[in-house]
């Protein structure tokens, strides 16, 4: 506990102090006090440096004094033999003696009191900034006018802090400009502008006379702006150092003015403006900018238009353009989107064809779509080559972004029929040799593909059974062979409406128009068991003269049987139509002149026997395309016969070409379309 | 018409083979399909196997896979079955039996051959 | 193979009745499945084919109906000639295979 004063004496004191003795005395006097320690007896052996007995006073780190020996007052009013004076409140006394003394010594009494120190002149730094007042135990400091004391008790600052400025425009100097501005002051000055503006801040390089910087480029005195987490400065030196105009893209701006305790010179002045906040004209590739500006400002509106093949991509939408507004803080609106190259996406598969996996699906990339070939071909020209356009679409020079479409090839078989091993009338054929062959178990009888929708057959075959079954792609008809062939669903028969329908249909004599259309449920894949027969054009290449020869299969009636399992076919050639009617009927149901002939009947056969029978009914008379000689056509139909192994008579497919051309696109599916 | 003659009934011994024979008339066997059907007595039908023409093989149901063949002769228009390590339960009525046409599975019945397996 | 479950084995039945015989497929044959009638002694005799087609000289009496796995072959009113065995069998690619038959006998 600190005491005002006290008492220390030596072991023993006035006796003679024992050997080997080490004693310490603690000090203590009350905070803002200093301790005068006097000595009024000293008598210890004495010794150089006091080595053997002395004792040791101390201050913190500092020995005051050593004392040994003895000594006497030169003062005959005062008995004080020694005396320390320190400044600060604590003090320490040690006492030591060594293991022997050579006479009698009686130690030492001393005597300490708490001192009034001056700690405005006792010590080398001045603890007040301005005015320094002492008094007992303590001192306090003081300002002159206009200053305050800063809350550390001892600097006296100006009140230059707190001003905020929030006018779109303003001044701001230094205490006192241009007088000596105040020492050790820190003023602070805040800018407070309305969102959307930076404070700009000019500086006239006159107007500025700070202290310099030190010898290590410290400024003792400095000016400090900051904005946000930007920093301008610390400035300081004669003649502003910086730019004279700061842009600090912030609306608000802190201004520090640090001075010490030395050097003052006139200070600064500044103005300040608030600027619509800029925004950079940023670099937005593949796009156009509107209005164009050298300088983008806060509350400015530009559209952004991409280039040709380039979109906006938000989401999942896709646009060509977009507005971007400058936005208080200095970035645009909208900074995330950008001018992307179209993507066109994967590209439709079409049917009957295929597309390549695209390397690239967008801008400029380029695809090409091809069909199944040889059942297959483009149809719709164009040449399949698309390239990603502007608008995100496929585009085709020729089809736009319609795509291509691949149809059958008509009248290609992809084995040619060979007349092989002799059979009476006929040959063995492969599917192959006739694709579009297609049999119907019900009654038993043939048709002919002319499309993927479409078979043509005899109007007598389907009279009876509007359903009928069929099936494509067999050289066999037994069950099993048709088990894995292609069944064909009806969806509807058209009959030509010129057949007239008869109530007993066995004795009929008119084929007059034996002709119609079975429209199928599903597409027919082609393939090589399975292609199309071309129908005929309309122009006179198309008429048949005598002689030409066509080919006829089916799975009708032969010598041996009633139905042949396999397909079988022959080459015939065309006969004037009174070839026909010069043949007896073999089992007349009416009289021989009943059975009507007319040019809607095209004559053939009667060489070597060879000839359509029973069974044959609907299947195709194939002749070859007079403009293109890989092609076949169907000139007729298998229609009726008035003997089998002589002449036939078939339907003149030619003559129906409008009423099947009709008839398909009405009736057609929007996909056909 | 078609019609299909069978050799005449067999006896014989477990682990011995039999060749049925079936001859048709009224065709020729080139244009047909012949498969063959046993009938165990009192049993129901079973299919052996086939041999088809449009593929040129032979097919043969995977019970009795090993231990069938089944040839022609086109020249004389005569199918042959033969069935090899006859066994006991290989007792049964053996038809040949001409595939039918659009749809219908069989056509001509031969008039069967009984085999009887017996020690 | 195709494993083919012929329902019921035996059927006793009367003159003039309903009658209708199941045949289930283990996958689907579409519609090639066929509907036999065996008489004792008698090679079969062919009555349905494609699952619902009357083949010609048999009594309209007879039907057949189904595709996929589930099939029926219905005797509308069973007549004395009637008695008999009746097999399915699938074919739509080999191996063949018949039902167990289904015996139908007079009550």
């Known amino acids: 506990e600190p005491t005002m004063y006290g008492e220390i004496l030596s072991p023993n004191y006035p006796q003679a102090y024992p050997s080997e003795v080490e004693k310490s005395w603690d000090i203590e006097v009350p905070e803002g006090y200093g301790i005068h320690l006097y000595f009024t007896h000293l008598d210890i052996e004495l010794s150089e440096n006091c080595a053997y007995d002395s004792v040791q006073i101390i201050s913190g780190d500092t020995e005051e004094g050593r004392l040994c020996g003895q000594r006497s007052s030169n003062n005959p009013h005062s008995p004080i033999v020694e005396e320390f004076q320190v400044p600060y409140n604590k003090l320490q006394v040690i006492f030591k003696s060594d293991f022997s003394n050579e006479e009698r010594f009686t130690g030492f009494a001393a005597y300490y009191v708490a001192t009034d120190i001056n700690e405005c002149t006792d010590f080398v730094d001045v603890p007040c900034s301005h005015f320094c007042n002492n008094f007992i135990g303590g001192y306090f400091c003081s300002c002159p006018p206009e200053y305050f004391l800063h809350d550390d008790m001892k600097n006296c600052g100006v009140n230059c802090s707190g001003d905020v400025f929030t006018a779109l425009i303003g001044e701001i100097a230094s205490p006192n400009y241009p007088k000596p501005y105040p020492e050790n002051s820190r003023c602070e000055y805040q800018i407070r502008l309305e969102k959307g503006f930076q404070v700009v801040v000019t500086l006239r390089r006159e107007d500025f006379d700070v202290e310099a910087a030190d010898s290590a480029g410290n400024c003792l005195d400095s000016l400090v702006f900051v904005a946000g987490d930007r920093q301008f400065g610390p400035y300081c030196g004669h003649g502003f150092p910086g730019p004279l105009n700061i842009e600090t893209k912030s609306n608000a701006l802190d201004i520090i003015f640090q001075t010490d305790l030395t050097g003052q010179k006139k200070g600064w002045k500044l103005r300040y403006h608030g600027d619509p906040m800029p925004c950079p004209k940023e670099d937005t590739p593949n796009s156009v900018w509107e209005p164009a500006k050298a300088k983008y400002v806060f509350r400015d509106v530009v559209q952004i238009t991409c280039l040709d093949g380039f979109e906006v991509v938000e989401g999942r939408v896709g646009a060509t353009s977009f507005y971007s507004t400058c936005q208080s803080n200095g970035k645009w609106s909208n900074s995330k989107l950008k001018c992307q190259p179209v993507d066109c996406g994967i590209p439709e598969s079409i049917e009957n064809g295929k597309v390549e996996d695209p390397e690239s699906t967008l801008f400029g990339s380029v695809i090409r779509y091809t069909c199944e070939e040889p059942y297959y071909y483009m149809e719709n020209g164009g040449g399949g080559e698309y390239h990603c356009a502007g608008n995100g679409s496929w585009v085709n020079e020729v089809l736009g972004p319609e795509l291509p479409k691949c149809v059958p090839v008509c009248g290609v078989p992809r084995e040619p029929f060979e007349e092989k091993q002799r059979i009476i009338g006929g040959s063995d054929a492969d599917i192959k040799n006739f694709p579009w062959q297609v049999f119907f178990d019900n009654p038993w009888a043939g048709g002919a593909l002319i499309n993927e929708y479409w078979v043509l057959t005899a109007a007598h075959v389907v009279e009876g059974n509007r359903e009928p079954t069929m099936y494509v792609g067999s050289t066999s008809v037994q069950t099993s062979r048709l088990a894995k062939s292609k069944m064909l669903t009806p969806e509807h028969v058209f009959i030509h409406p010129g057949w007239k329908l008869l109530e007993v249909p066995e004795g009929r004599t008119n084929f007059d128009n034996d002709i119609a259309l079975v429209r199928l449920k599903d597409p027919v894949k082609m393939g090589p068991t399975v292609s199309p027969i071309c129908l005929p054009g309309t122009s006179s290449d198309y008429n048949l003269m005598d002689g030409d020869l066509g080919l006829i299969s089916g799975w009708g009636r032969t010598e041996k049987r009633d139905r042949a399992v396999r397909l079988k076919a022959a080459r015939l050639p065309v006969a004037p139509l009174r070839k026909c009617k010069e043949v007896k009927v073999e089992k007349p149901t009416a009289d021989a002149e009943a059975y009507v002939f007319t040019p809607n009947m095209i004559c053939a056969g009667g060489e070597k026997g060879m000839d359509s029978c029973k069974g044959d009914s609907g299947g195709a008379f194939a002749v070859q395309d007079p403009n293109d000689k890989t092609k076949f056509y169907a000139a007729g139909l298998v229609s009726w016969g008035p003997q089998c192994g002589t002449y036939g008579l078939y339907t003149r497919v030619k003559n129906y070409v409008d009423w099947i051309m009709k008839t398909m696109q009405e009736n057609s599916t929007p996909r056909e379309d | 018409q078609v019609q299909l003659v069978q050799s005449g009934a067999e006896v014989k011994k477990p682990g011995a083979s039999v060749k049925v024979s079936c001859k048709v008339s009224g065709d020729t066997l080139t244009e047909l399909s012949m498969h063959w059907v046993r009938q165990a007595p009192g049993k129901g039908l079973e299919w052996m196997g086939t041999f088809d023409p449009e593929e040129g093989e032979t097919i043969y149901a995977q019970k009795f896979q090993g231990r069938v063949t089944m040839t022609e002769d086109t020249s004389t228009d005569t199918a042959y079955m033969e069935l090899s390590s006859l066994r006991s339960e290989d007792t049964a009525v053996y038809y040949c039996?001409?595939?039918?046409?659009?749809?219908?599975?069989?056509?001509?019945w031969g008039q069967g051959t009984l085999v009887t397996v017996s020690s | 193979d195709i494993q083919m479950t012929q329902s019921p084995s035996t059927l006793s039945a009367s003159v003039g009745d309903r009658v209708t015989i199941t045949c289930r497929a283990s996958?689907?044959?579409?519609?090639?499945l066929a509907w036999y009638q065996q008489k004792p002694g008698k090679a079969p005799k062919l009555l349905i084919y494609?699952?619902?087609s009357l083949e010609s000289g048999v009594p309209s009496r007879f039907s057949g109906s189904g595709s996929g796995t589930e099939f029926t072959l219905t005797i509308s009113s069973l007549q004395p000639d009637d008695f008999a065995t009746y097999y399915c069998v699938q074919y739509p690619s080999y191996s063949w295979t018949f039902g167990q038959g289904t015996k139908v006998e007079i009550k």
């Open positions: 494609k699952a619902s």
């Open positions: 039996v001409t595939e039918g046409e659009a749809g219908r599975p069989f056509d001509a």
């Open positions: 996958q689907s044959i579409s519609s090639w």
